[in-house]
């Protein structure tokens, strides 16, 4: 029950996170004009990953796309790439996790397969979240660098009395959406990974084992101790030892040819 809840919650949290990453990627307000000591401006600029916009004091807004690939800063391209990778991985993770949900029955899919898929989707969510957080952080760092650079050159003299005022940009709403969304996707991914452990069949849940002395030398099969990750081929609680180790309530069987060295 707790496993189902953890898995379900992980899925929902990741879903919200990925929706947020998509929203942040599409938003125009990655950077907004710094209003410093001027709260009302005649022209207000803000920029996204795909276009830049201008809002005039009348409320009229005009946006222009970045219709060039080669002319854009490498950092912006990197941020775009990180966000897209995050969305793609997240979308695939969501698709995988839907089939992995314990509450959904698909044919005769065994628990180990579901555990496998849960872990896979969890890892995908973690990477997706990290991509989003990295993308937003790279952009934020770029803004901070440019902000202080433009503050240093706030007013550059141009031939006597003529001046140009550099527009300074600060963090836009999309950055905060991206950070929160990336964090949620990451948390969702961790929850999926935790749920995976509970979904994996218990393979080391043995009854009391009695060792019977036998005349022949007994060799334990290699790979006897398998970690219970759910990735093994043992899907049922089958015996791992075929040698002299026998459970007390088992009928003693004759040694097989595999038992001899």
């Amino acid at each position: 029950m707790a496993v189902t809840a953890c898995q379900g919650l992980g899925f929902v949290v990741s879903l919200i996170g990925i929706a947020g990453i998509i929203a942040a990627t599409c938003m125009d307000q990655w950077s907004t004009q710094d209003l410093y000591n001027n709260p009302v401006t005649a022209v207000f600029n803000y920029q996204g990953l795909w276009r830049s916009c201008v809002r005039e004091s009348s409320g009229f807004t005009e946006c222009r796309g970045y219709f060039t690939l080669l002319g854009l800063p490498a950092m912006l391209q990197a941020v775009r790439a990180l966000m897209i990778v995050g969305i793609v991985l997240g979308a695939i993770g969501l698709l995988v996790s839907i089939f992995a949900l314990k509450c959904i029955r698909i044919g005769s899919m065994e628990d180990s397969a579901k555990a496998n898929m849960t872990l896979t989707s969890g890892i995908m969510f973690i990477v997706s979240g990290l991509c989003a957080i990295a993308g937003v952080s790279v952009f934020a760092n770029m803004l901070v660098t440019n902000f202080w650079m433009s503050t240093a050159n706030m007013y550059t003299g141009m031939g006597g009395m003529v001046q140009t005022v550099q527009t300074r940009y600060t963090f836009g709403a999309a950055l905060f959406v991206g950070w929160v969304a990336g964090g949620l996707t990451l948390i969702g991914g961790v929850m999926m990974c935790i749920a995976c452990r509970g979904l994996a069949p218990e393979e080391t849940n043995y009854k009391a084992v009695s060792y019977h002395a036998s005349g022949h030398s007994v060799a334990y099969k290699p790979g006897g101790f398998k970690a219970s990750t759910g990735f093994g081929s043992n899907t049922k609680n089958k015996k791992i030892y075929d040698g002299g180790a026998r459970t007390e309530d088992e009928v003693q069987s004759y040694p097989s040819k595999h038992d001899y060295v």
Partner: antibody, heavy 118, light 113 residues
Framework: QVQLKESGPGLVAPSQSLSITCTIS????????VHWVRQPPGKGLEWLVV???????VYNSSLKSRLSLTKDNSKSQLLLKMNSLQTDDTAIYYC????????????WGQGTSVTVSS | DIVMTQSPSSLTVTAGEKVTMTCKSS????????????LTWYQRKPGQPPKLLIY???TRESGVPDRFTGSGSGTYFTLTVSSVQAEDLAVYYC?????????FGSGTKLEKK
């Protein structure tokens, strides 16, 4: 059609305050901003204040302490108040509509003449 | 505040003549976000309120004759009347529309020769 009409006292004594009303028709104060501009005799245009459609008001920094602008949506009116008038405040006072784009003033009232004299 | 400087202060013209007046701003009025210059031109005839001619430095207001042309970018702008008509005799003002407070130039008076 779009119309703006200013109405004021005409004559004001020095150090007194001035109240001018701009009555608008053909548009809403919730959709368009309204500017106040004046022109002293023999001089150029001087921008005074704007009330934007979102309710934000921006004043000319040199006159900010003496100006106040309020709007009455129900009457479609804007009231400009100016304190401590001096003779150099003698001018024609205009209200003008803020254009939907371009940050320009597209429709103007005929103006009201204000003379500051004792 | 932005200082707008217009020159010349007056121009004497004859009908049909081409005239150009200039306007300089103390700061750039160009906005890189939408690639527009926030400069406006107005015409004011005696006893009348100002009339909007050109906004965004070069966009004519509807109803304005195409003999009026605005140009320029950054800090330097011009208004050209390709063939002056009698009804064009007026004072022309440029206005900063980029920064509050909006500021006007001192005007260029177009007079008959």
């Amino acid at each position: 059609q779009v119309q703006l009409k200013e109405s004021g006292p005409g004559l004001v004594a020095p150090s007194q305050s001035l109240s001018i009303t701009c009555t608008i028709s053909g548009f809403s104060l919730n959709t368009y901003g309204v500017h106040w501009v004046r022109q002293p005799p023999g001089k150029g245009l001087e921008w005074l204040v704007v009330m934007l459609s979102d309710g934000n008001t921006v004043y000319n920094s040199s006159l900010k302490s003496r100006l106040s602008l309020t709007k009455d949506n129900s009457k479609s009116q804007l009231l400009l108040k100016m304190n401590s008038l001096q003779t150099d405040d003698t001018a024609i006072y205009y209200c003008a509509r803020h254009k939907a784009y371009g940050n320009a003033m597209d429709y103007w009232g005929q103006g009201t003449s204000v003379t500051v004299s004792s | 505040d932005i200082v707008m400087t217009q020159s010349p202060s007056s121009l004497t013209v004859t009908a049909g003549e081409k005239v150009t007046m200039t306007c300089k701003s103390s700061q750039s009025l160009f906005n890189s976000g939408n690639q527009r210059n926030y400069l406006t031109w107005y015409q004011r005839k005696p006893g009348q309120p100002p009339k909007l001619l050109i906004y965004w430095a070069s966009t004519r207001e509807s109803g304005v004759p195409d003999r009026f042309t605005g140009s320029g970018s950054g800090t330097y702008f011009t208004l050209t009347v390709s063939s002056v008509q009698a009804e064009d005799l007026a004072v022309y003002y440029c206005q900063n529309a980029y920064y509050f407070p909006f500021t006007f130039g001192s005007g260029t008076k177009l007079e008959k020769k």
